[in-house]
C-alpha cells in the first residue's frame, strides 16, 4: 500500500534570466528512494539515481544544474520555461510517487519599469 | 572499456535447460539494472528480463515467465538467465545488456546462441 | 502491452538522403522511446534515448523527436555505413517492447 505524499514548492514564479529551484520532497513512508526523475512536458530533464548519481539531458545541460539534494536547479530562464514541471519519485515497494510544479518566467521588474516610466 | 561477455548458449532439447552468464567489466556492475534480450533468426528484437541493481527487483516478458529466472552476483559482476522448459520457439541469440537510469539500454553484450531442437 | 508500430519496414535510399523513420505507441509514452542501429551478426548500438537526447559518440546527422505516442528517428544525410536495420523501444512500462524495424537498404 501506498501511504507516501509528495509535497512540491506548488505554483512559482521567476524572473526572466534568473534561475529557480524546483523541490520536491517525499513524506509519511519508509519506501527507498531510488530514482528521481526530474521531466517537463512529455521531455526529460535530468534523472537523480540512488547508485548512478546524476544525469542531465545534452539539450539542457548548459541552463540545468543539479540539487539542492533531490531537487534541480533551472538557469537562465526563458518566458518558454513557463510550464508544469514534474518531479516521479521511483521507489522500492511502494512504487512512484507524482509530484507537480507550475513555473511562470515573467519579464525582469526592470524591463516593467522601463515600460512604464518611459518618458513622452 | 564496458565489456559485456555473455556464455551458456548451445544446443538443447525441448523441455531441456540452460543457464546463460554474462561477465561484466569497465564499470560498476552492481549499480546499473541489466536485462536479457533475444533475437529469433532473422527475427527483431524480444526483451526477455530485467533486474534492477540495489533492490533486485525482476521483471519478465510473459512468454517466459514461471520458466526463466534472472539473477545477479554482484560480487562476481555477473548475471545469469536460467532457462528452463525451453522450447522451439526460445530458439535466439540472447544478448546481455545494461540499463543505466532503467530507461535506455547503453551497451550490449556480443550474444550467445540458443538452439532448441530435437 | 504497449505496442510499438515502426514504418516503414523498409526502404531504399542514396548516400546523402535525408531519411525519415517513425515508431508509433499505442498508448501515451511521454518521451520514453529510444532508438537502436542493427547491422548484420551485430549487437544493437544505442543512438538516440528518452526520445531526443543523441547517444554519446553517435554522429550529429542522428537525430531524434516526439513525444506521447508518435517519435522519429532522422538521418539529415545518409551515410554508407548508416545502412543498416534500426528499431524504437519503449521503456515507459514492463514488458519493454520493441518496433519491428525498419532496414535501410542501397537503392
Known amino acids: 500500500m501506498m501511504t507516501g505524499t509528495i509535497e512540491t514548492t506548488g505554483n512559482i514564479s521567476a524572473e526572466k534570466g534568473g534561475s529557480i529551484i524546483l523541490q520536491c520532497h517525499l513524506s509519511s513512508t519508509t519506501a527507498q528512494v531510488t530514482q528521481v526523475n526530474w521531466e517537463q512536458q512529455d521531455q526529460l530533464l535530468a534523472i537523480c539515481n540512488a547508485d548512478l548519481g546524476w544525469h542531465i539531458s545534452p539539450s539542457f545541460k548548459d541552463r540545468v544544474a543539479p540539487g539542492p539534494g533531490l531537487g534541480l536547479t533551472l538557469q537562465s530562464l526563458t518566458v518558454n520555461d513557463t510550464g508544469e514541471y514534474f518531479c516521479i519519485y521511483h521507489t522500492y515497494p511502494d512504487g512512484t510517487y507524482t509530484g507537480r510544479i507550475f513555473l511562470e518566467v515573467l519579464e525582469s521588474s526592470v524591463a516593467e519599469h522601463g515600460a512604464r516610466f518611459q518618458i513622452p | 572499456e564496458v565489456q559485456l561477455l555473455e556464455s551458456g548458449g548451445g544446443l538443447v532439447q525441448p523441455g531441456g535447460s540452460l543457464r546463460l552468464s554474462c561477465a561484466a567489466s569497465?564499470?560498476?556492475?552492481?549499480?546499473?539494472?541489466m536485462s536479457w534480450v533475444r533475437q529469433a533468426p532473422g527475427k527483431g528484437l524480444e526483451w526477455v528480463s530485467d533486474?534492477?541493481?540495489?533492490?533486485?527487483?525482476?521483471s519478465y516478458a510473459d512468454s517466459v515467465k514461471g520458466r526463466f529466472t534472472i539473477s545477479r552476483d554482484n560480487s562476481k559482476n555477473t548475471l545469469y538467465l536460467q532457462m528452463n522448459s525451453l522450447r522451439a520457439e526460445d530458439t535466439a541469440v540472447y544478448y546481455c545488456?545494461?540499463?543505466?537510469?532503467?530507461?535506455?539500454?547503453?551497451?550490449w553484450g556480443q550474444g550467445t546462441l540458443v538452439t532448441v531442437s530435437s | 502491452d504497449i505496442q510499438m508500430t515502426q514504418s516503414p519496414s523498409s526502404l531504399s535510399a542514396s548516400v546523402g538522403d535525408r531519411v525519415t523513420i517513425t515508431c508509433r505507441a499505442s498508448?501515451?509514452?511521454?518521451?520514453?522511446v529510444n532508438w537502436y542501429q542493427q547491422k548484420p551478426g551485430k549487437a544493437p548500438k544505442l543512438l538516440i534515448y528518452?526520445?531526443?537526447s543523441l547517444q554519446s559518440g553517435v554522429p550529429s546527422r542522428f537525430s531524434g523527436s516526439g513525444s506521447g505516442t508518435d517519435f522519429t528517428l532522422t538521418i539529415s544525410s545518409l551515410q554508407p555505413e548508416d545502412f543498416a536495420t534500426y528499431y524504437c523501444q519503449q521503456s515507459y512500462s514492463t514488458p519493454l517492447t520493441f518496433g519491428g524495424g525498419t532496414k535501410v537498404e542501397i537503392k
Open positions: 545488456a545494461r540499463v543505466p537510469y532503467s530507461v535506455w539500454i547503453d551497451y
Open positions: 569497465g564499470f560498476t556492475f552492481s549499480s546499473y539494472a
Open positions: 498508448q501515451s509514452i511521454s518521451y520514453y
Open positions: 533486474i534492477k541493481s540495489s533492490a533486485g527487483s525482476t
Open positions: 528518452a526520445a531526443s
